[in-house]
Amino acid sequence: FEIALPRESNITVLIKLGTPTLLAKPCYIVISKRHITMLSIKSGERIVFTFSCQSPENHFVIEIQKNIDCMSGPCPFGEVQLQPSTSLLPTLNRTFIWDVKAHKSIGLELQFSIPRLRQIGPGESCPDGVTHSISGRIDATVVRIGTFCSNGTVSRIKMQEGVKMALHLPWFHPRNVSGFSIANRSSIKRLCIIESVFEGEGSATLMSANYPEGFPEDELMTWQFVVPAHLRASVSFLNFNLSNCERKEERVEYYIPGSTTNPEVFKLEDKQPGNMAGNFNLSLQGCDQDAQSPGILRLQFQVLVQHPQNESNKIYVVDLSNERAMSLTIEPRPVKQSRKFVPGCFVCLESRTCSSNLTLTSGSKHKISFLCDDLTRLWMNVEKTISCTDHRYCQRKSYSLQVPSDILHLPVELHDFSWKLLVPKDRLSLVLVPAQKLQQHTHEKPCNTSFSYLVASAIPSQDLYFGSFCPGGSIKQIQVKQNISVTLRTFAPSFQQEASRQGLTVSFIPYFKEEGVFTVTPDTKSKVYLRTPNWDRGLPSLTSVSWNISVPRDQVACLTFFKERSGVVCQTGRAFMIIQEQRTRAEEIFSLDEDVLPKPSFHHHSFWVNISNCSPTSGKQLDLLFSVTLTPRTVDLT
């Protein structure tokens, strides 16, 4: 190889060891029998050398640095050449570095021809191995603007006081042009301006200077976004840190065409604007930091540009002004991430503050719109608390647990509507009365409706799940001892059509000691399946539950248990079951931890089934499943 650098070219070539391939033996640059691992060639020098190995690209890298001085004379503006030409260089990983020094008052603009650049974060690499590292200067301090790959949106970067651009090319890459030009501009009066051009839908992730380290103190950096007028842009902050400010405040400012309040100023922790039509600017302004404990300011954000959806022009009013203790959250439903570009899916408050999730609270009227290609990507979760603090005022008071029509009219599927029902301890209990009798969901008879009610204790220390219930069964009411949450969970979009079937009334009733009482009025046509609460995890220790089962005068009920033994093993106390005829008060008592469960039994009158648990040993829990079937009395049962 021969490298000859013209005099006055201000080019230095450095060949040095890269990261060695550990299993290989060292490779050397050989110059007239001398073996060396580093070779520096300066302007005006000509050097002939060879390598001592077959694959020097596995050992060495080459750096070609050109110093461009715009301080003492005119600047060579225009398209930047690769000098020396890549064809004259050994096939090593190459880094071309252009170091441009200019006066503070002169702006320098790097213009990137297509393909434009895409910024990458720490630890990321470019698929083709071609990277552009760009840094600027504040006095004597070097500031990293960022590292970029090809195929992005960044078209221009403006700086002042100098710029250092490093283009890294892998040894096998055929590229022989720099892909950028330098132009002079008037002073930009800030650290830098990055222009990002969108031709169509897409996204760009960008970072503050020096990211992930701190943005320089009291500096200003601007991003200019060029967006076709028919598209919409939304900004979301992926990662940010604030420093400790002594004077001024760290902030972002937006210049949004058409806005009457330009510049719009936001804190970094605010929701950032979305649904913006056309071009806009975003600026990051630092502050004077505390000298003792400066902290760091850094920002990584994403701009998503997409077609406005039909929904984005529709405003939905969610009137929660008459509601109390209620919150509504619209959020993305969990999905597997795909690698291809997925347009954003945002919900916007007052059409401008858009984010991927939004929580509305009671007491106000909210105007929302959607910026989303497919609203099935979102769902809605609502929580409402109904609490009674004064037992004298609440007793016998009833509340309808009904999803408000405002919510049902939104174009987003309702996932959960949870009512938290709170009562004063040991003073009142609750009764749930459905508009339509309920069926308990079991493996033997699953619910196939578009929604269910999930009933669970709302006492933090108590792990008690009564079960999942849907309309169309035999459970007439559910009484519970203390605080519970009732969640209406939807399973199909057809819930909108079936919404009329929902309806549950809760009443506050005098306190009782049992954890729960289910009132069951079986129909003659079907078998009723019932199971103990906390199925699969076992009825909690020392918990008692009852079923009040009605038997019509002309019917006989067959009570069947689906196991021979309960399987419970008691650590302390006894687990037992009482089956009691309501008319005669005659009762049978079974020791669940000792006896076998009763064989199918026939009941001519209404009866109680009461199950009380002991403190079981772990792994030997109490789970019981039983059924009740009605048959006409005329059938000979012998």
Epitope: P20, L22, P26, I36, S52
Partner: antibody
């Protein structure tokens, strides 16, 4: 397992030559530079030179150029170092070692005594 | 040629103490290698490529440095660490060794 076994101790007269051998096992000498160093009694290590068995290229410390000859026989995985015009100050333990970026395998050493 | 100067020539320390061995090059070196030698034995590879421990070398050893100044550090000396340590450069032939540092028991 990797080993470099050197030939036995030699006693030589001044002005004569000595040829020390170094047989490698457990690795391919083509993948290593085969170096020779020496250590005079109570002294430090002194690099003599190497051979690249892949292409038979050799390098010597200028101090030993013309007096030391390093060769290698790939077929027997053996490296040799011959030192001519011996003088009493050449009395030392001569070590061979194979080197790559990561691994360095050393022989046990051969004591060469030059005495009249 | 590149001259490597090791200092100190002798380091007298007690077990449990920290040892810092220095190797200074007369011109810039890409990587440095360290070897340990005990009396009557061949040198053993100890640190390769400036900072990587050779196989079997305890983690109390570390290597650092760049350019012309390199260091081998033993965080807490064990009895088996008392030996002579040599540095060697592979950046430019002849591939010289330092004069060695003897770490002896105080």
């Amino acid at each position: 397992q990797v080993q470099l076994v050197q030939s036995g101790a030699e006693v030589k007269k001044p002005g004569s030559s000595v040829k020390v051998s170094c047989k490698a096992s457990g690795f391919n000498i083509k993948d290593y530079y085969m170096n020779w160093v020496r250590q005079a009694p109570g002294q430090g290590l002194e690099w003599i030179g190497w051979i690249d068995p892949e292409n038979a290229n050799t390098i010597y410390d200028p101090k030993f150029q013309g007096r030391a000859t390093i060769t290698a026989d790939e077929s027997t995985s053996t490296a040799y170092m011959e030192l001519s015009s011996l003088r009493s100050e050449d009395t030392a333990v001569y070590y061979c070692y194979g080197s790559s970026y990561r691994f360095t395998y050393w022989g046990q050493g051969t004591l060469v005594t030059v005495s009249s | 040629e590149i001259v490597l100067t090791q200092s100190p020539a002798t380091l007298s320390l007690s077990p449990g103490e920290r040892a810092t061995l220095s190797c200074s090059a007369s011109s810039s070196v890409s990587y440095l290698y360290w070897y340990q030698q005990k009396p009557g034995q061949a040198p053993r590879p100890w640190i390769y490529l400036t900072s990587n421990l050779a196989s079997g070398v305890p983690a109390r050893f570390s290597g650092s440095g760049s350019g012309t100044d390199f260091t081998l550090t033993i965080s807490s000396l064990e009895p088996e660490d008392f030996a002579v340590y040599y540095c060697q450069q592979w950046s430019s032939n002849p591939f010289t060794f330092g004069g060695g540092t003897k770490v002896e028991i105080k």
